[in-house]
Interface confidence: medium
C-alpha cells in the first residue's frame, strides 16, 4: 500500500503567441480545482477507462478576478497536495490524467457552475520511494507545471511497496529471520511468506502463501507475461525445463481483449478496439449506457437508455474512437499543399503557406515569377497560375534560354531592312515608309505627313532613321513602365482576393476534414 502525491506548481498561459483568455472576469469571478486519475500500466491514458489506481480531487483555489487589461498571469492554485492512496502494489508504470476545472461563482441557478478548462495526460515509469519527478504539460494554450512521486505507507517498502517491514525487536539487531530494512535503520524486513516459487520480480504477497502478480504478468507464480499463449505460437527460445517453446512478448497472443474486442500490437504493448457497449484497456468494462457518461472530450452520447442497447458517441473535431477517447492528429493527413505548415487549432485546421502560395490548403500558386524563372534578362509575366517570359533581344524559348535571331521573322514591312540592336531590333525603312516596323506610308493620302525635309536631307537619310528609332524607344520604355505599374496593382488585387477566399474556404476545409 502507498500514496501517489501530486503537487501542482502553476497553471497559466503557455509560451508562444495566442495567449488564452482569462477564465475569470470581474463579472464572473471563479476559482480553480484539479482532478487526477491514475491507471496502472502504459494503458491508453484517455478518460474512458476507470481510474483503477485511484483518483483524487483537490481543494478549491482562491477566488480569482481578472484585472482588466492585464496579461493573464498564472492562476491562483489550491493549497496542498493531491493524494491518491493505492491499496495494492505500485505498478511501476502508470498513466495519468490531470484535469483543471473552473468553478464559476456568479449567481447561477442551482449553485456554482463547473467547466473543464484543460486536460493533460501522460504515461510514465516511476519507482515508489524515489524523489519528486517534475513535469510540464501543455493543453492548447495552457501550461501546467507539476511534480509527483509515489511513496509507500508503512509497513510496506520497496520500489513496488510490496516488501513488508516491522519495527526492530531489539535496539541493535533484527529478530530471528528478519533482515535490516533499508533505508529505514530502525525497521526490519519481514520474512518471505509468499508461495514457494513466486517470482520475486513480478509477484508479491500480502498474505502468507499467496502470489499476486504485478501489471503485465500472470500465472500461479507470476512468471508468464500477460496475453501470451502456451506453446502454440512459438516466438522465443526453447525452454530446457518444459521442452516447449516459451512465447516471447507477443502482446496480442491469446487475444487479451475481452467481449469481442480486437487486438492490435503497438510498439510497447497492445491496443484493444472494443465493440460498442464495452471499454477499458481490455474491453472489460461493460453494460454502459449514456447515463454512465461514456463519451469523452465533449463527445455527444446518443441512445443506450437501457443496459442492452448500445450507445453512440458523436465526437467533436479532433477526437475519434467509440468513446471519443483518441485524439486525431489531423495534421498527419497532410492537408496543406505545396509545403505549407499545418496548425490544428482544435475547432479548425489552418495552413500556413510558403511565400508564393495561398488558399486554405496553399493550393493556389500565386507567384510563379518569384523564382526568377526567365534567363538572359527576360521579364517574367504572370497569369493564370502559370508564367511566361518576355525575352530580351536575341533570346527566345519558354525560359529565354534559347538564342534567337530577332530579324529571322522578317519584322520590317514594305522592304525595310532589319538590324539587331542591344535595345531591340531596328527597321531601316524603304523610301516612302515610316514607323517602328515600316508599317506606315509617308504620304497616305497624297499629302506629306511630315514637314518637308531640310535642304540636303533626303527621307532615307540615317539621321532621320535614328530620330525615328529614338522616338520608338521612348514609347517602348513608357509602355514597359506602364505595364509594370498595372502588373503590381493587379498582383495586389489578386493577393487580396486570395486572402478573402482563404477565410471563406476555411470553414469548408474544416467540414471536409471532419467528414
Amino acid at each position: 500500500a502507498g500514496v501517489f502525491e501530486l503537487q501542482i506548481h502553476s497553471f497559466g498561459p503557455g509560451p508562444g503567441p495566442g495567449a488564452p483568455r482569462s477564465p475569470c472576469s470581474a463579472r464572473l469571478p471563479c476559482r480553480l480545482f484539479f482532478r487526477v486519475c491514475l491507471k496502472p500500466g502504459l494503458s491508453e491514458e484517455a478518460a474512458e477507462s476507470p481510474c483503477a489506481l485511484g483518483a483524487a480531487l483537490s481543494a478549491r483555489g482562491p477566488v480569482y478576478t481578472e484585472q482588466p487589461g492585464a496579461p493573464a498571469p498564472d492562476l491562483p492554485l489550491p493549497d496542498g497536495l493531491l493524494q491518491v492512496p493505492f491499496r495494492d502494489a505500485w505498478p511501476g508504470t502508470f498513466s495519468f490524467i490531470i484535469e483543471t476545472w473552473r468553478e464559476e461563482l456568479g449567481d447561477q441557478i442551482g449553485g456554482p457552475a463547473w467547466s473543464l478548462l484543460a486536460r493533460v495526460a501522460g504515461r510514465r515509469r516511476l519507482a515508489a520511494g524515489g524523489p519528486w519527478a517534475r513535469d510540464i504539460q501543455r493543453a492548447g494554450a495552457w501550461e501546467l507545471r507539476f511534480s509527483y512521486r509515489a511513496r509507500c505507507e508503512p509497513p510496506a517498502v520497496g520500489t513496488a511497496c510490496t516488501r513488508l517491514c516491522r519495527p526492530r525487536s531489539a535496539p541493535s539487531r533484527c529478530g530471528p529471520g528478519l533482515r535490516p530494512c533499508a533505508p529505514l535503520e530502525d525497521e526490519c524486513e519481514a520474512p518471505l511468506v509468499c508461495r514457494a516459487g513466486c517470482s520475486p520480480e513480478h509477484g508479491f504477497c500480502e498474505q502468507p502463501g499467496e502470489c499476486r502478480c504485478l501489471e503485465g504478468w500472470t500465472g500461479p507464480l507470476c512468471t508468464v507475461p500477460v496475453s501470451t499463449s502456451s506453446c502454440l505460437s512459438p516466438r522465443g527460445p526453447s525452454s530446457a525445463t518444459t521442452g516447449c517453446l516459451v512465447p516471447g512478448p507477443g502482446p496480442c497472443d491469446g487475444n487479451p481483449c475481452a467481449n469481442g474486442g480486437s487486438c492490435s500490437e503497438t510498439p510497447r504493448s497492445f491496443e484493444c478496439t472494443c465493440p460498442r457497449g464495452f471499454y477499458g484497456l481490455r474491453c472489460e468494462v461493460s453494460g454502459v449506457t449514456c447515463a454512465d457518461g461514456p463519451c469523452f472530450n465533449g463527445g455527444l452520447c446518443v441512445g443506450g437508455a437501457d443496459p442492452d442497447s448500445a450507445y453512440i458517441c458523436h465526437c467533436p473535431p479532433g477526437f475519434q474512437g467509440s468513446n471519443c477517447e483518441k485524439r486525431v492528429d489531423r495534421c498527419s493527413l497532410q492537408p496543406c499543399r505545396n509545403g505549407g505548415l499545418c496548425l490544428d487549432l482544435g475547432h479548425a485546421l489552418r495552413c500556413r503557406c510558403r511565400a508564393g502560395f495561398a488558399g486554405p490548403r496553399c493550393e493556389h500558386d500565386l507567384d510563379d515569377c518569384a523564382g526568377r524563372a526567365c534567363a538572359n534578362g527576360g521579364t517574367c509575366v504572370e497569369g493564370g497560375g502559370a508564367h511566361r517570359c518576355s525575352c530580351a533581344l536575341g533570346f527566345g524559348g519558354r525560359d529565354c534560354r534559347e538564342r534567337a535571331d530577332p530579324c529571322a521573322a522578317r519584322p520590317c514591312a514594305h522592304g525595310g531592312r532589319c538590324y539587331a540592336h542591344f535595345s531591340g531590333l531596328v527597321c531601316a525603312c524603304a523610301p516612302g515608309y515610316m514607323g517602328a516596323r515600316c508599317e506606315f506610308p509617308v504620304h497616305p493620302d497624297g499629302a506629306s505627313a511630315l514637314p518637308a525635309a531640310p535642304p540636303g536631307l533626303r527621307p532615307g537619310d540615317p539621321q532621320r532613321y535614328l530620330a525615328g528609332v529614338i522616338a520608338v524607344i521612348v514609347v517602348v520604355v513608357i509602355a514597359i513602365v506602364a505595364g509594370i505599374v498595372v502588373l503590381v496593382i493587379s498582383r495586389k488585387k489578386r493577393m487580396a482576393k486570395y486572402e478573402k477566399a482563404e477565410i471563406k474556404e476555411m470553414g469548408e476545409m474544416h467540414r471536409e476534414l471532419n467528414a
Partner: antibody
Framework: EVQLVQSGAEVKKPGASVKVSCKAS????????MHWVRQAPGQRLEWMGV????????NYNQEFKGRVTLTVDTSASTAYMELSSLRSEDTAVYYC????????????WGQGTTVTVSS | DIVMTQSPDSLAVSLGERATINCRAT??????LAWYQQKPGQTNKLLIF???TLQSGVPDRFSGSGSGTDFTLTISSLQAEDVAVYYC?????????FGGGTKVEIK
C-alpha cells in the same frame, strides 16, 4: 554569406538520445524555415521535419513516430534536432538545410553531423 | 508517401558530352521537383527547383524538364567538376522524399 554550421560528431548507445545543433549566420534566422534531413551510409536522403523559427511551429515525418523534436533558440540563431530512443539504424549523417522563401525547398545546407549508434 | 525513383544508378559520360538523369514520382507532383548535387567534403547544392528553374549561380549547362510524374536533369556538356551524386526530391507535399541518387562519373 549564408552559412549553417553544425555541431560535431556524436557516438551514442542504443536507447539514448542525441541533440544536434545548427548555427545560422548571414541572414535573418526567423525569416526562413529550417529542414532536417538525414542520410544513412549508402542510403538515400531522408527528410525528418521542418520548423518555423519565428514561432517553433513544426511538421514532422511520421516515419519517426514521435522520436524527433525540433527546437530553436532565436537569440542564438540556432536550430536543434533531438532524436530519442536511438537504434543502430539511426547511424547516419544529419543535415540542417535552410528553406528558401520562394519555391525552392532547401537552398543552403549545413556540413552534416555524423551520429553513430553502437553498443 | 510519394516514392521517387531515379535512373540510372550510375552514369559514365565523356567530358563535353551530354548526361541525362531521370526521376519518376509515384503520383503527380505537378512541377514541384528539385535536383541537388552532393560532393564529398562539400555542402549539398541546390541546382534546380520547380522542375526547370535554375537556382541562382548554377551554370546554365544544367537544365531540368518535366512535370507530373516524369522529370529529367540534363548536363549539356559534362565538366570535370560535375562528377558527383545527384538527387531528385519532390517538394509538393510532406513528407518530402528523395530519389535514390545517381552517381555521375567521367568515362
Amino acid at each position: 554569406e549564408v552559412q549553417l554550421v553544425q555541431s560535431g560528431a556524436e557516438v551514442k548507445k542504443p536507447g539514448a538520445s542525441v541533440k544536434v545543433s545548427c548555427k545560422a549566420s548571414g541572414y535573418t534566422f526567423t525569416s526562413y524555415w529550417m529542414h532536417w534531413v538525414r542520410q544513412a551510409p549508402g542510403q538515400r536522403l531522408e527528410w525528418m521535419g521542418v520548423i518555423d523559427p519565428s514561432d517553433s511551429l513544426a511538421n514532422y515525418n511520421q516515419e519517426f513516430k514521435g522520436r524527433v523534436t525540433l527546437t530553436v533558440d532565436t537569440s542564438a540563431s540556432t536550430a536543434y534536432m533531438e532524436l530519442s530512443s536511438l537504434r543502430s539504424e539511426d547511424t547516419a549523417v544529419y543535415y540542417c538545410a535552410r528553406d528558401s522563401t520562394v519555391v525552392a525547398p532547401m537552398d543552403y545546407w549545413g556540413q552534416g553531423t555524423t551520429v553513430t549508434v553502437s553498443s | 508517401d510519394i516514392v521517387m525513383t531515379q535512373s540510372p544508378d550510375s552514369l559514365a559520360v565523356s567530358l563535353g558530352e551530354r548526361a541525362t538523369i531521370n526521376c519518376r514520382a509515384t503520383k503527380s507532383i505537378s512541377k514541384y521537383l528539385a535536383w541537388y548535387q552532393q560532393k564529398p567534403g562539400q555542402t549539398n547544392k541546390l541546382l534546380i527547383f520547380s522542375g526547370s528553374t535554375l537556382q541562382s549561380g548554377v551554370p546554365d549547362r544544367f537544365s531540368g524538364s518535366g512535370s507530373g510524374t516524369d522529370f529529367t536533369l540534363t548536363i549539356s556538356s559534362l565538366q570535370a567538376e560535375d562528377v558527383a551524386v545527384y538527387y531528385c526530391q519532390q517538394h509538393h507535399e510532406y513528407p518530402y522524399t528523395f530519389g535514390g541518387g545517381t552517381k555521375v562519373e567521367i568515362k
